[in-house]
């Protein structure tokens, strides 16, 4: 599930300033921990890289929705 991965107190201090093509993304995690300075999204790419992104950006929200739908459609 895109948002069910538990990353112990991982925070985003900087976010990517360019769009990542949706076909490169595998999953995401919401960061809302109180010990983090801001809410953020960590995208995991198909190459295994983790990238912080700003959930206020339209491309980030669209990518999250797309991954949610993909995940749901993969369920048996």
């Amino acid at each position: 599930q895109p948002d069910s991965v538990s990353i112990p107190i991982t925070c985003c201090f900087n976010v990517i300033n360019r769009k990542i093509p949706i076909q490169r993304l595998e999953s995401y995690t919401r960061i809302t921990n109180i010990q983090c300075p801001k809410e953020a999204v960590i995208f995991k790419t198909k190459r295994g890289k983790e990238v912080c992104a700003d959930p206020k950006e339209r491309w980030v929200r669209d990518s999250m929705k797309h991954l949610d739908q993909i995940f749901q459609n993969l369920k048996p």
Epitope: Q1, P2, D3, S4, R30, T32, P37, K38, E39, P55, K56, K65, D68, Q69, F71, Q72
Partner: antibody
């Protein structure tokens, strides 16, 4: 530690307006969205709308569109909700809450607004 | 708008009981579901987001499951402090909507 502190209870006449404030500490409000949710006595929760304090962009439940104004002052880390043309059905506890994802992890203590002639 | 139907609206249970509350959306909400606990005179408290993700500090007796339109909150062994009203909320699309609530009372 995140805290959202709201203004005190209000008693208003039908047809008037009310403005409720929500002062945030422990977070930068421009990094998040500030939402307003209300709860009538003995009833459930109802989302009214939200603001992106970074740019002032707002989104509302169409039910409240035109009657509610949400603003934010980033210099004082305060969000405001003003509801106009009050009627008795607007008697409720009004909560502010934060959440960029659409769910709400921190809430104010609530402000009781009573509309009565 | 997406409507959320929660059931039951109230239930009576004893300490130690397993309690299940269900929430049904009028359309697929793709796991964008949150659960809250509210006690009288207090603001709601977030328990679960993303249908299954337990918030920090929430006891493990609370769990969430489901997908598509149908979701469940389970309290595996009810404790005295769990007597409260529980709400589900969808955050797939605005306007964000809540279920009508389930009041868990002492039997």
């Amino acid at each position: 530690q995140v805290q959202l502190v709201q203004s005190g209870a209000e008693v208003k006449k039908p047809g008037s307006s009310v403005k409720v404030s929500c002062k945030a500490s422990g977070l930068t409000i421009s990094d998040t969205y500030m939402h307003w949710v209300r709860q009538a006595p003995g009833q459930g929760l109802e989302w009214m709308g939200r603001i992106d304090p970074a740019n002032g962009n707002t989104k509302f439940d169409p039910k409240f569109q035109g009657r509610v104004t949400i603003t934010a002052d980033t210099s004082t880390s305060t969000a405001y909700m003003e509801l106009s043309s009050l009627r008795s059905e607007d008697t409720a506890v009004y909560y502010c809450a934060r959440g960029v994802f659409g769910f709400f992890d921190y809430w104010g203590q609530g402000t009781t607004v009573t509309v009565s002639s | 708008d997406i409507q959320m139907t929660q059931s039951p609206s109230s239930l009576s249970a004893s300490v130690g009981d397993r309690v299940t509350i269900t929430c049904k959306a009028t359309e697929d909400i793709y796991n964008r579901l949150a659960w809250y606990q509210q006690k009288p005179g207090k603001a709601p408290k977030l328990l679960i987001s993303g249908a299954t993700s337990l918030e920090t500090g929430v006891p493990s007796r609370f769990s969430g499951s489901g997908s598509g339109k149908d979701y469940t909150l389970t309290i595996s062994s009810l404790q005295p402090e769990d007597f409260a009203t529980y709400y589900c909320q969808q955050f797939w699309s605005a306007p964000y909507t809540f279920g009508g609530g389930t009041k868990v009372e002492i039997k």
